[in-house]
Interface confidence: low
């Protein structure tokens, strides 16, 4: 691929590219892409591989340029890079490109999988780990158990999965999980299929998600006491302001991280 001539990295090191409020947002959110150069620059360019490019220019005599994407649509998602240049570099000469920033604009995140490690059948006295695996890193994961209104556990994970440990004696039951962006504006995933954990000798069974009537879906945070959590089968009701789950009354048998947990 032919690109504008790029000098050695030591001459014009790459800038940093970040997104506010987040790199994963719902459609309609205003997103600001910030390109920060390690030295004052004259022109910044925002690039999207293969697009009619540069996508946007900013002429600013400073280290920072902001590119405003108003009321983003899914089509504006994708990979972005930025470069900077100075007038004394000569025509067509740009800095090294920034690392890739991937902007995801979506109503909901892909459904995670929920699996038991080492398996869904628990022996006497053995603990079991449930792994909720999505596709994105740096997400907050939430585990539910059928018949328990409040979420059982929260985990913030740098990996695209989180492991939840269940004590063997209390492990059997029906579970589901989901994940969401760790900060506002929150984007929630679809919830996983349910997973049945059973005692040795009983045999596990898989059930479609809609047949878990006792489980509760993510509801509004405690700051909205008048609102009711929707049922699990209507996981993403239209019109509800989507918020991630915040710790509420915890089930006594399997405590969740306290509210100070950074993943909450």
């Amino acid at each position: 691929d032919i690109t504008p001539s790029v000098p050695p990295a030591s001459y014009h090191p790459k800038p940093w590219l970040g997104a506010q409020p987040a790199t994963v947002v719902t459609p309609g959110v205003n997103v600001t892409l910030r390109c920060r150069a390690p030295q004052p620059a004259w022109r910044f360019g925002l690039f999207k591989p293969g697009e009619i490019a540069p996508l946007l220019f900013r002429d600013v005599s400073s280290e920072l340029a902001e590119f405003f994407l108003e009321e983003v649509t899914p089509a504006q998602g994708g990979i972005y890079r930025c470069c900077y240049r100075r007038p004394d570099w000569g025509p067509g000469v740009w800095s090294q490109p920034s690392d890739v920033l991937e902007l995801l604009v979506t109503e909901e995140l892909p459904r995670p999988s929920l699996v038991a490690l080492p398996g869904p059948v628990v022996g006497p006295g053995a603990n079991v780990s449930l792994r909720c695996a999505g596709r994105l890193r740096n997400m907050s994961f939430v585990l539910y158990r059928e018949g328990v209104a409040a979420p059982l556990q929260y985990r913030h994970s740098a990996q695209p999965w989180a492991d939840f440990t269940l004590l063997g004696a209390r492990a059997p039951g029906t579970y589901s999980c989901y994940y969401h962006t760790p900060s506002a504006p929150y984007v929630l995933s679809q919830r996983s299929e349910v997973l049945v954990i059973s005692w040795e000798g009983e045999g596990p069974e898989a059930r479609p998600a809609s047949s878990a009537p006792g489980m509760q879906a993510p509801g509004p945070p405690p700051s909205d006491p008048g609102a009711q959590a929707p049922s699990l089968s209507s996981f993403r009701p239209r019109g509800l302001v989507l918020q991630p789950l915040l710790p509420q009354t915890q089930d006594s048998w399997d405590p969740a991280p306290p509210p100070s947990d950074p993943g909450v």
Epitope: P4, F47, G50, A75, G92
Partner: antibody, heavy 118, light 108 residues
Framework: EVQLLESGGGLVQPGGSLRLSCAAS????????WTWVRQAPGKGLEWVSG???????NYAQNFQGRFTISRDNSKNTLYLQMNSLRAEDTAVYYC????????????WGQGTLVTVSS | QSVLTQPPSASGTPGQRVTISCSGS????????VSWYQQLPGTAPKLLIY???NRPSGVPNRFSGSKSGTSASLAISGLRSEDEADYYC?????????FGGGTKLTVL
Amino acid sequence: EVQLLESGGGLVQPGGSLRLSCAASGFTFSDYYWTWVRQAPGKGLEWVSGSPVFGAANYAQNFQGRFTISRDNSKNTLYLQMNSLRAEDTAVYYCAKAGFTGGHFDIWGQGTLVTVSS
Amino acid sequence: QSVLTQPPSASGTPGQRVTISCSGSSSNIGNNYVSWYQQLPGTAPKLLIYGNSNRPSGVPNRFSGSKSGTSASLAISGLRSEDEADYYCQSYDSSSWLFGGGTKLTVL
């Protein structure tokens, strides 16, 4: 080696349809903006349509509604579906790949001739 | 009628310097890159200049591009017989790619 190979051209009657293909090899097809450019006999280059990596395809005004560009990243292939063809659509049709940051077409196919005549 | 305007023809003798102009507006050339293509008879266009003044590898430094305001130009120095071809400028606006009408260069 980087290569683009167009096919699907030929003789078609006015009002007819034709589908052109452009098979790419030698680089990651899905990473780039792809485009069709045409050249009528003895005339200059005319941009027809483009297929971005993300988002909706774009078209020159003359072709909106009659022509449809599409891509199959799994097959490394770009397509141009041409409907309601007219005599003035007679041209060599080239597919081309856009460069990363320069707003230019760095790789071109050899072209395929479309003749619209009764 | 092309949005980018080029002279239909240009000529020069071997060794001479020839310049081809391309005129546009603030919505295309004024705010965006200009590229130049060479099309030899019976062949596909070939990228000659991109980003106003950059040469792809393999293009001789006899070819140079420049841009000023809403106009651009392609200069060919040390003209050779193999430079006889059609030359097209190209830029873009917010939604389309634009080509000049082309300039037929004759080496006398």
